[in-house]
């Protein structure tokens, strides 16, 4: 019976630390898509609707904040898109890019932790242009840190929720 | 406040060329595109082409491929429209129009005519 | 090609009516539609982008409904100045006008 007892307290000890391990998933936020055709940051995205969660780390002013120091990976997918219904490209040869930012407050400074992304011509013929990128990567991240995502021509971005979105989630303690 | 002045009337043989001034004023002519759009008598309008003024990059309708060349000149902030082998059929009002997307913003070419011109009546006859 | 359909292609009606326009896409076009007015011998003006939005300066009784392949214009109580052609537009494509006139 003691036997029993510790291993149903050690299953809660190790579920309530899963719990507690810090992650995040954001989906864009179609409705405030900012516009411009260089370089811009996306600062809406959703944190807790469809397929959006996040659990021990903060969102906001655009930026996922890390309340936990540790080893995260890090996440984001990026889709383009056009289709001639929406009109058409003023210039048919693009640069489509995504940037994950780090920001720390405590010693201001910002670094590209990632990059991805292509130079397209997407040809006025035809109907429809599609283009994906995603980027991963394992990271050390400290406490009030701030993960952000810039991307190029944000007009361009596909709103649906498995189509553009970033994430974070820690694997690991720093020792 | 935004205009776009058009020349004036014109008087063509068939087989002639014809070419269509578009003076704007009142906002920054190289972010935005302006489109070609005519209306024969009795007809629907029609949109003819556009200019990308910032870069110059221009579309046609496939229509006019070939008979039409669309030119503009930033430091006159003037359109210029083309049309060559003119026809009886080309008599019509052909009118100016900018589009509302503001290049600086974004790179659609959205189709929306927020200003147009007062339009100029190509009559094309022997 | 989107062929756009306009109808009625001309009507008639009273100071005050409720006058509705409508449009037909050949195939869906989500909800980039808009609507022009013409006069003769004036600027084409254009009335609603995007289906429903007001374009600036237009007067509130204008209306524009719709998403897909099929739109509506309203023009809530006619009013004397609004005796003109309507047209429909999408990207490259115009609808072949409804003349509006006061009976």
């Known amino acids: 019976e003691k036997a029993m007892v510790d291993g149903s307290w050690l299953d809660l000890a190790k579920r309530s630390k899963l719990e507690a391990q810090p992650f995040a998933h954001l989906t864009i936020n179609a409705t405030d898509i900012p516009s411009g055709s260089h370089k811009v940051s996306l600062s809406s995205w959703y944190h807790d609707r469809g397929w959006a969660k996040i659990s021990n780390m903060t969102f906001s002013n655009g930026k996922l904040i890390v309340n936990q120091d540790g080893f995260y990976y890090l996440y984001a997918n990026i889709c383009f898109r056009h289709h001639e219904t929406s009109g058409d490209l003023a210039t048919e040869y693009l640069q489509l890019m995504v940037y994950v930012t780090k920001t720390s407050i405590k010693i201001p400074s910002s670094h590209t932790l990632m990059k991805g992304g292509s130079t397209k011509y997407w040809s006025g013929n035809s109907e429809f242009h599609f283009y994906s990128i995603n980027v991963g990567g394992f990271f050390k991240l400290r406490s009030g840190e701030e993960i952000s995502i810039e991307v190029s021509n944000p007009s361009l971005l596909d709103p649906d929720q498995d189509a553009t979105y970033f994430g974070a989630f820690k694997v690991r303690d720093i020792d | 406040q935004v205009q776009l002045v058009q020349s004036g009337a014109e008087v063509r043989k068939p087989g002639a060329s014809v070419k269509v001034s578009c003076k704007a004023s009142?906002?920054?002519?190289?972010?935005?595109?302006i489109h070609w759009v005519r209306q024969a008598p009795g007809q629907r309008l029609e949109w003819m082409g556009w200019?990308?003024?910032?870069?110059?990059?221009?579309k046609f309708s496939q229509k006019f491929q070939g008979r039409i060349t669309v030119t503009r000149d930033t430091a006159a902030s003037t359109a210029y429209m083309e049309l060559r082998s003119l026809r009886s059929e080309d008599t019509a009002v052909y009118y100016c129009?900018?589009?509302?997307?503001?290049?600086?913003?974004?790179?659609?070419?959205?189709?929306?005519?927020?200003?147009w011109g007062q339009g100029t009546l190509v009559t094309v006859s022997s | 090609e989107i062929v756009m359909t306009q109808s009625p292609s001309s009507l008639s009606a009273s100071v005050g009516d409720r006058v509705t326009i409508t449009c037909r896409a050949s195939?869906?076009?989500?909800?980039?539609l808009n609507w022009y007015q013409l006069k003769p011998g004036k600027a084409p003006r254009l009335l609603i982008y995007?289906?429903?939005s007001l374009q600036s300066g237009v007067p509130s009784r204008f209306s524009g409904s719709g998403s897909g392949a099929e739109f509506t214009l309203t023009i809530s109580s006619l009013q004397p100045e609004d005796i003109a052609t309507y047209y429909c537009?999408?990207?490259?494509?115009f609808g072949q006008g409804t003349k509006v006139e006061i009976k």
């Open positions: 200019i990308n003024a910032g870069n110059g990059n221009t």
């Open positions: 995007g289906a429903s």
């Open positions: 009142g906002y920054d002519f190289s972010n935005y595109a």
């Open positions: 129009a900018r589009d509302t997307s503001n290049m600086v913003r974004g790179i659609i070419i959205a189709y929306y005519f927020d200003y």
């Open positions: 537009q999408h990207t490259r494509a």
């Open positions: 195939q869906s076009i989500s909800r980039y």
